[in-house]
C-alpha cells in the first residue's frame, strides 16, 4: 500500500524519495509521474533526472533537496485539490527490471480559514508561478526564474506544516529509500 502524505490547498506538498549514489557524479536516472508506477518508466512525467542533471520539469514541480546526493524528493508548489492522488518515484537502476518503484499517495485538505494572512503565509508572493521549463543550458536568462524563490526558514516552516507531524528522519525510514553502489 502507498505511504500517505498530506498538504493543504495553497501550500507546498513534499513527497520524499531517496537513494544513495555511488558518487555525486555517478547518479541514477529518476522520474516522477502522476499516477501509480507502471511496468516501465513513469506515466504523466512531471520531473526527470539523468546521470548528471535535472533535465525535465514542469511548472510547479521541483527538487528541494540535493539530487546529487540522491535526495530526489518532489516538491509540488501551491497545491490544489486536483493534485490529490498517487505519485510515482522511479529510480531507474541499470539492468533489466532493476528499477525501484515507490507509490506515494498525496491527500490535499481544504485550507484552514485564518483571520488575516501574515506575510509569511503570502504563498502567492513566496512561491510565484513558474513557466514550464525543459532541460536547458546554464545561461542566466534561461534558468533565473525557473524555480521559486524560497528561503530555508520557509522550507522549515512549511515542512513542519506539510509533513503532518512526520519527522525528516521518519521519511528516510518510510520505504522510499534505496542504496546504490
Amino acid at each position: 500500500s502507498e505511504v500517505e502524505y498530506r498538504a493543504e490547498v495553497g501550500q507546498n506538498a513534499y513527497l520524499p524519495c531517496f537513494y544513495t549514489p555511488a558518487a555525486p557524479g555517478n547518479l541514477v536516472p529518476v522520474c516522477w509521474g502522476k499516477g501509480a508506477c507502471p511496468v516501465f518508466e513513469c506515466g504523466n512525467v512531471v520531473l526527470r533526472t539523468d546521470e548528471r542533471d535535472v533535465n525535465y520539469w514542469t511548472s510547479r514541480y521541483w527538487l528541494n533537496g540535493d539530487f546529487r546526493k540522491g535526495d530526489v524528493s518532489l516538491t509540488i508548489e501551491n497545491v490544489t485539490l486536483a493534485d490529490s492522488g498517487i505519485y510515482c518515484c522511479r529510480i531507474q537502476i541499470p539492468g533489466i527490471m532493476n528499477d525501484e518503484k515507490f507509490n506515494l499517495k498525496l491527500v490535499i485538505k481544504p485550507a484552514k480559514v485564518t483571520p488575516a494572512p501574515t506575510r509569511q503565509r503570502d504563498f502567492t508572493a513566496a512561491f510565484p508561478r513558474m513557466l514550464t521549463t525543459r532541460g536547458h543550458g546554464p545561461a542566466e536568462t534561461q534558468t533565473l526564474g525557473s524555480l521559486p524563490d524560497i528561503n530555508l526558514t520557509q522550507i522549515s516552516t512549511l515542512a513542519n506544516e506539510l509533513r503532518d507531524s512526520r519527522l525528516a528522519n521518519d521519511l528516510r525510514d518510510s520505504g522510499a529509500t534505496i542504496r546504490i553502489g
Epitope: G25, D53, L63, N64, K69, H136, G137, P138, P148, I150
Partner: antibody, heavy 121, light 107 residues
Framework: QVQLQESGPGLVKPSETLSLTCTVS??????????WNWIRQPPGKGLEWIGY???????NYNPSLKSRVTISLDTSKNQFSLKLSSVTAADTAVYYC?????????????WGQGTLVTVSS | EIVLTQSPATLSLSPGERATLSCRAS??????LAWYQQKPGQAPRLLIY???NRATGIPARFSGSGSGTDFTLTISSLEPEDFAVYYC?????????FGQGTKLEIK
C-alpha cells in the same frame, strides 16, 4: 543580474585556517536548483574546484581537499563561506565563488571577481 | 579524476585571424565539456557548454565542437577583446576538472 563577491583576509599564516565569504546579490541565492561553489587558481596555474553547498545546506567537496574544507551557508545574509584548515604555501591562490544549476550540473555560469589569498609567515 | 590537456599552451595570432584551441581528455567525457575565457584580473566567463552550445550573450564568432576525448574551440575572426586565456572543463566525471589553459596573445 546575479552578482557574486568574495571577501576575506588576503594574508594567512601557515597552519592557520583560511576563511572567505561570498555574498550573492540579484535574487537567485535562495532558489532551489542552484549550487554555490568555491574554485581556486594558484598563481600562473589552472583552476581547481573545491566544493559546493546547496541551498538546503548539503555540501560536497573535492576529495583532494575534503579533510580540510568546510563550506557553510547564511541565508539571512545571502552568503556562503569557505574554511580551509592547516594551510600551506601551496594554498596560495585566487579564490572564486561561482554558481551552477541542477539543469547543467558543474557548468559555472556566474563567478565572483576572485580574491587573492597568500599563505605566508 | 579526468585530466584535460590543452594545446597549444600559447597561441600568437593577429586580429581578424581564425583561432583554433584544442582540449584533450584522458578518457571520454562524451559532450560534457565547457570553455571559459579569462582576462587578466577577471573571473572566468562561460563561453560554451556541453561542447557546442553558446552561453547567453556570447558572440557567434565563438564555436565549440568535438565529443569523446577531443574538443575544439574556434574563434572565427579574432577581435582585440578576444585575447585572453581559455580554459576547458569537463563535467562528465566527478569531480569536475579544468585544463591548464591556452593563452591567446596578439602577434
Amino acid at each position: 543580474q546575479v552578482q557574486l563577491q568574495e571577501s576575506g583576509p588576503g594574508l594567512v599564516k601557515p597552519s592557520e585556517t583560511l576563511s572567505l565569504t561570498c555574498t550573492v546579490s540579484g535574487g537567485s541565492f535562495s532558489r532551489g536548483g542552484y549550487y554555490w561553489n568555491w574554485i581556486r587558481q594558484p598563481p600562473g596555474k589552472g583552476l581547481e574546484w573545491i566544493g559546493y553547498i546547496y541551498y538546503s545546506g548539503s555540501t560536497n567537496y573535492n576529495p583532494s581537499l575534503k579533510s580540510r574544507v568546510t563550506i557553510s551557508l547564511d541565508t539571512s545574509k545571502n552568503q556562503f563561506s569557505l574554511k580551509l584548515s592547516s594551510v600551506t604555501a601551496a594554498d596560495t591562490a585566487v579564490y572564486y565563488c561561482a554558481r551552477d544549476h541542477y539543469s547543467s550540473s558543474w557548468t559555472f555560469d556566474y563567478w565572483g571577481q576572485g580574491t587573492l589569498v597568500t599563505v605566508s609567515s | 579524476e579526468i585530466v584535460l590537456t590543452q594545446s597549444p599552451a600559447t597561441l600568437s595570432l593577429s586580429p581578424g585571424e581564425r583561432a583554433t584551441l584544442s582540449c584533450r581528455a584522458s578518457q571520454s567525457v562524451s559532450s560534457y565539456l565547457a570553455w571559459y575565457q579569462q582576462k587578466p584580473g577577471q573571473a572566468p566567463r562561460l563561453l560554451i557548454y556541453d561542447a557546442s552550445n553558446r552561453a547567453t550573450g556570447i558572440p557567434a564568432r565563438f564555436s565549440g565542437s568535438g565529443s569523446g576525448t577531443d574538443f575544439t574551440l574556434t574563434i572565427s575572426s579574432l577581435e582585440p577583446e578576444d585575447f585572453a586565456v581559455y580554459y576547458c572543463q569537463q563535467r562528465s566525471n566527478w569531480p569536475p576538472t579544468f585544463g591548464q589553459g591556452t593563452k591567446l596573445e596578439i602577434k
